[in-house]
Interface confidence: low
């Protein structure tokens, strides 16, 4: 069953290469287990950036080496992607799955265009 997922259209990464955005889903049921996946779409290629499964009311747990962190509050997930560089500019899509209990629901957002601008190198000072 399809589920609506909302996310901002555009986000500008900080000078330190950090971008944050909220992914909100319209839950049709009382899910206890939710999976959130961030996908990056660039040049018609879609790759998985990170994914986390969490129990409602608990923190999101990404893999230790993940570039993502996040917190959840109700039907909102606050996602932060770190270590971004200019070449990482692209459309970041939020995918939410209500894993448990059945029935399974899947929602895919329209994507957040994240713009990353590499900071200008500091001029050498004598």
């Amino acid at each position: 069953k399809a589920m609506h997922v909302a996310q901002p259209a555009v986000v500008l990464a900080s000078s330190r290469g950090i971008a944050s955005f909220v992914c909100e889903y319209a839950s049709p049921g009382k899910a206890t287990e939710v999976r959130v996946t961030v996908l990056r779409q660039a040049d018609s290629q879609v790759t998985e950036v990170c994914a986390a499964t969490y129990m409602m009311g608990n923190e999101l747990t990404f893999l230790d080496d993940s570039i993502c962190t996040g917190t959840s509050s109700g039907n909102q997930v606050n996602l932060t992607i770190q270590g971004l560089r200019a070449m990482d500019t692209g459309l970041y899509i939020c995918k939410v799955e209500l894993m448990y209990p059945p029935p399974y629901y899947l929602g895919i957002g329209n994507g957040t265009q994240i713009y990353v601008i590499d900071p200008e190198p500091c001029p050498d000072s004598d």
């Epitope: 399809a2 999976r35 894993m99 448990y100 209990p101 399974y104 899947l106 895919i108």
Partner: antibody, heavy 122, light 107 residues
Amino acid sequence: EVQLVESGGGLVQPGGSLRLSCAASGFTFSSYTMSWVRQAPGKGLEWVATISRGGGYTSYPDSVKGRFTISRDNSKNTLYLQMNSLRAEDTAVYYCAREDYGSSYVHWFAYWGQGTLVTVSA
Amino acid sequence: DIQMTQSPSFLSASVGDRVTITCRAGENIYSYLAWYQQKPGKAPKLLIYNARTLAEGVPSRFSGSGSGTEFTLTISSLQPEDFATYYCQHHYGSPRTFGGGTKLEIK
């Protein structure tokens, strides 16, 4: 080796009831969502019911909702399907199926039993 | 419910042939599609899930492709044991529905 063995099929009159069983072995039964899928003679496959790992949550298509009840006994590694108010169109081979999950955790039917035939006829 | 349409319904081919079966979804199901093989009097057997991932123990002559609404199952070189009926099934949420089947017969 995963094994699913259905039983309980047979001939029943329209309006009657039947209870199917599926004995599971070769895996940790309580760790998997389970389902029933049916196939009318010479026809395609139709999902009938799904039950969560602990048995607290169930799901049905509209065609059987309110008439069929899926349940499980994890202590006995057994899945059940209670079928009431049976109709001629419920005549089919009923398969018990174990669900599996990929990286995205979407469900498909990874293992199937051999099936048990239910015939609803006067 | 998402309607799944398979074509052709019947297909005649010879051992060694390359065959392709098509499955169309009534709406976008991304890559959430499975393929099953069923022989007469037997239970279905999972071949492919997530549109292109081969299930354990399935020969590499089977392959799946597609996304969105159009999917294909290809058998690169038919073997005698491949003559069977093939079903597609979306696993994009509930209720999961199957295609009508494609019966692959010996020419």
